[in-house]
Interface confidence: low
């Protein structure tokens, strides 16, 4: 056996961030036409040695690990062989696992819009966050003439929320606005972590 | 109309393990929310235990990750809890329960929580 | 975690009381708090949530302030139905908590 594309295969020292995909590759050829096989830390890789197990593109001569996470941590070495010999490769693999953090809104937005009556106005948050982020869009409303209840704290109106009926939950779209619209709009973003919100004015 | 059921069995001895299933009916498990079990104490305090969202992704109380697994089988639209080493501590109604997101505020439908006792 | 500290347990009421309950938090919760009533032998009912938003066909004797560290539920006229436990809860911080409970009984 021989390996066809060593290009491919340089890059033996692999830092993946935990969740990501992992693909290692070990194009080969031969007459007869090799095999593949694939082991970790000098053993047999089986497919019960990781949560959700692995894929193997015989096709493409690579291995496939979907949501890595810390315990996939070593080397895995691809052996190619026929009946005149094998060939083998080593890549190392580390999870590197962040800190998830609360999520981080970008300076600036949403933006403070202004529009005639009649117009239509975007308001756009960008978020950051390593953790699933839900979004929300809030705005101070008027309850029986009043904008604060007998606390003294607004009213609040939630217009729109990340899941399952919002799409582009980042954008709030308002169209043909009136001057009930004018106001504060809040962009509100939760993960497991904490929350983070920013606002813009309507005018 | 939207119904979680519990189910499961009502006597644990110590020591043991504790597997509940929540069956979900007229809302796919897959499609939103995110899936909690609650648990309410005699004296009535509540404890959040933990949940598995919509993308299969689990969140669990600290006090209990060692011993909590949430998991689902999607064909059936149903979660499960599995609570290892038991004490009688864990003598509890247990509710599953299900919440838009995390940040939302609201456990929306409850289902009607399942006694469990754990004694030798 | 973040803790909860409902009072009070008890309130011992007469049909058509204004009663309030409060829930301080150790730390700020922005306005991510609910408010739950549990009838005996029955799951909790979600009535409030974001502080002061009534969830759909919850009568409007019952209201929700607050932000921050600082809740307050309150019945207006209490009816006969409304004998139950309530509960705070907060989910702006994993873990989820929930307030010990305040327990409506007739005077």
């Known amino acids: 056996p021989y390996w066809t594309n060593t290009e491919k295969m340089e890059k033996r020292l692999h830092a993946v961030p935990a969740a990501n995909t992992v693909k290692f590759r070990c194009p080969a050829g031969g007459n007869p036409m090799p095999t593949m096989r694939w082991l970790k830390n000098g053993k047999e890789f089986k497919q019960e040695h990781r949560i959700g197990g692995y894929k193997v593109r015989n096709q493409h001569w690579s291995l496939i690990m979907e949501s890595v996470v810390p315990s996939d941590k070593g080397n895995y070495t691809c052996v190619v062989e026929n009946e005149y010999g094998s060939i083998n490769h080593t890549y190392h693999l580390d999870v590197v696992e962040r800190s998830p953090h609360r999520p981080i809104l970008q300076a600036g937005l949403p933006a403070n819009a202004s529009t005639v009556v009649g117009g239509d106005v975007e308001f756009v948050c960008k978020v950051y966050s390593d953790a699933q982020p839900h979004i929300q869009w809030i705005k101070h409303v008027e309850k029986n003439g009043s904008k604060y209840g007998p606390d003294g704290l607004p009213y609040l109106k939630v217009l729109k929320h990340s899941g399952i009926n919002s799409s582009n939950a980042e954008v709030l779209a308002l169209f043909n606005v009136t001057e009930a619209d004018a106001g504060e709009y809040i962009c509100k973003v939760s993960n497991y972590i904490g929350q983070a919100n920013q606002s813009a004015w309507l005018t | 109309d939207v119904h979680l059921q519990e189910s499961g069995p009502g006597l644990v001895k110590p020591s043991q393990s504790l597997s509940l299933t929540c069956s979900v009916t007229?809302?796919?498990?897959?499609?939103?929310?995110?899936w909690n079990w609650i648990r309410q104490f005699p004296g009535n305090k509540l404890e959040w235990m933990g949940y598995i969202t919509y993308d299969g992704s689990n969140n669990y109380n600290p006090s209990l990750k060692n011993r909590l697994s949430i998991t689902r089988d999607t064909s059936k639209n149903q979660f499960f809890l599995q609570l290892s080493s038991l004490t009688t501590e864990d003598t509890a109604t247990y509710f599953c329960a299900r919440v838009y997101y995390y940040g939302s505020g609201n456990f929306d439908v409850w289902g009607t929580g399942t006694t469990v006792t754990v004694s030798s | 975690s973040i803790v909860m500290t409902q009072t009070p347990k008890i309130l011992l009421v007469s049909a058509g009381d204004r009663v309030t309950i409060t829930c301080k938090a150790s730390?700020?919760?922005?306005?991510?708090v609910a408010w739950y009533q549990q009838k005996p032998g029955q799951s909790p009912k979600l009535l409030i949530y974001?502080?002061?938003n009534r969830y759909t066909g919850v009568p409007d004797r019952f209201t929700g302030s607050g932000y921050g560290t600082d809740f307050t539920f309150t019945i207006s006229t209490v009816q006969a139905e409304d004998l139950a436990v309530y509960f705070c809860?907060?989910?702006?911080?994993?873990?989820?908590?929930f307030g010990s409970g305040t327990k409506l009984e007739i005077k």
């Open positions: 809860h907060q989910d702006h911080t994993s873990p989820f908590t």
């Open positions: 730390q700020s919760v922005s306005n991510d």
């Open positions: 007229g809302y796919s498990i897959t499609s939103g929310y995110y």
């Open positions: 974001y502080a002061s």
